[in-house]
């Protein structure tokens, strides 16, 4: 920044150094240079001399006016032309910023990913503010009435060990910057209701060449949660629409799910789970590809999820970039 220079006068901004984007602003420069009655005062923005909208107010002061200022950051400084001085003399400089007050944080969500040891709270921050915006996450026990506050710039991980006030909590988020402050709605949570099971992973697929060929998808999770509900979605890579199968699952053994698919087609599979009856789902697992054979049985395993040449062996490919699938890690 430009704020650490030695000044021979001073520079200030109206209405403020940080202001709402799109405002009209005035930058004032006042010289206080020994033995110098400035002939002229100059303004520079990001090192470039400004030519227009400069008004001389008195012998030592000038004003630069900007209409509808839209730059998030700029370094301003001003100089004086002093008689008998060959070069312009630096008066002072200032970093200015424009942006927006924060939106109300919404969609506040807190989850505990199994084995993480943390409660992760996220929210939709709204539109970009362009200026430094901080968030205070308030976590208040509904049982002990104790409140903890966590300062962050984005999301927050709170150790579950620090949640000593029982199982029921109130969570809300305050957003603040130099231009304003907003507060989210309050979220009430029960710690047992927000656990997301350990990720479900598809490990391999095989197509058995029976009278009607069937594809078996093998998938598993390291979860210790007993009652888990899962969804597997699949589609031909050329399709836009997913087919979804639902399962009530017991992960004491590897799951095997059967599908009757068209021959000689490349399919993509994903799985996600939640604790039965609870609020939040896992994000969808990474894309798993399997090409059904024309006639010969085949096996596709996770280890071979990459592009291969068709040499009569398993033909499997993965390239998440090729698919325009709804593969966001949604948890709601």
């Amino acid at each position: 920044g430009i704020t650490n220079i030695n000044c021979s006068g001073h520079i200030w901004v109206e209405p403020a150094t940080i202001f709402k984007m799109g405002m009209n602003i005035s930058i004032y420069c006042q010289a206080a240079i020994k033995n110098c009655q400035p002939r002229k005062l100059h303004f520079y923005k990001n090192g470039i001399k400004e030519r227009f909208q400069i008004t001389r107010i008195n012998k030592t002061t000038a004003r630069l006016w900007y209409k509808n200022f839209l730059e998030p950051h700029a370094s301003m400084y001003c100089t004086a032309e002093c008689p008998k001085h060959f070069q312009e003399t630096l008066i002072c400089g200032k970093d200015i910023s424009s942006g927006y007050p924060p939106d109300i944080p919404d969609e506040v969500t807190c989850v505990i990913y199994e084995y993480s040891g943390n409660m992760t709270c996220t929210w939709n921050a709204g539109k970009l503010t362009y200026i430094d915006t901080k968030y205070v996450v308030h976590v208040k026990s509904l049982e002990t009435e104790e409140e903890q506050q966590y300062l962050t710039s984005s999301y927050i991980n709170i150790s579950t060990d620090s949640l000593q006030g029982g199982k029921k909590y109130l969570v809300w988020v305050q957003a603040a910057n130099a231009l304003g402050m907003e507060e989210s709605k309050q979220l009430q949570i029960h710690l047992d209701d927000i656990v997301i099971p350990s990720a479900a992973v598809i490990s391999r697929a095989e197509t058995i060449n029976a009278t009607v060929p069937k594809t078996i998808i093998y998938w598993d999770s390291q979860t210790t949660i007993e009652k888990v509900s899962c969804e597997m979605r699949y589609k031909a890579t050329t399709n836009q629409t997913w087919n979804v199968k639902e399962f009530d699952t017991n992960f004491t053994y590897v799951q095997q799910s059967e599908f009757y698919l068209e021959p000689n087609i490349k399919y993509v599979f994903q799985v996600r789970c939640q604790e039965t009856g609870k609020r939040y789902w896992q994000p969808w697992s990474s894309l798993f590809f399997h090409k059904t054979p024309e006639t010969v049985p085949q096996v596709t395993s996770k280890a071979f999820q990459h592009d291969t040449w068709n040499s009569g062996l398993t033909v499997a490919s993965i390239s998440t970039g090729h698919l325009t699938s709804d593969n966001r890690g949604d948890i709601g």
Epitope: K140, E145, L170, K185, Q186, Q188
Partner: nanobody
Framework: EVQLVESGGGLVQAGGSLRVSCLAS????????MAWYRQAPGKQRELVAS???????LYADSVKGRFTISRDSAKSMVYLQMNSLKPEDTAVYYC???????WGQGTQVTVSS
């Protein structure tokens, strides 16, 4: 100054029902999680139930299936319907706004055996 005024307490026989109400000043009910707490003689105050602005609820294990919390934002009211009352439900019941720590003066509920 926010005011919370509870009403509807009284004496009831075990197995009976009672509905306590809380009238809040301003629009506090429409914007905040609202809760009922209770305090029995010689015991700590405890959460009974809470309800958020979307109507989602939390209950103490001891009242689950028997008590129902509800809200009417238009009337600035919060209710606690108590069924299958037991002698151990005897307490002063307080309306509360957890976000701000606002409390009512309480209403006495006595369940006789």
């Amino acid at each position: 100054e926010v005011q919370l005024v509870e009403s509807g307490g009284g004496l009831v026989q075990a197995g009976g029902s009672l509905r306590v109400s809380c009238l809040a000043s301003g629009n506090i009910v429409s914007r905040n999680v609202m809760a009922w707490y209770r305090q029995a003689p010689g015991k700590q105050r405890e959460l009974v139930a809470s309800v958020d602005t979307g109507g989602s609820t939390l209950y103490a294990d001891s009242v689950k299936g028997r008590f129902t919390i509800s809200r009417d934002s238009a009337k600035s009211m919060v209710y606690l319907q108590m069924n299958s009352l037991k002698p151990e439900d005897t307490a002063v019941y307080y309306c509360n706004v957890p976000r701000y720590g606002y409390w009512g003066q309480g209403t006495q509920v006595t369940v006789s055996s």
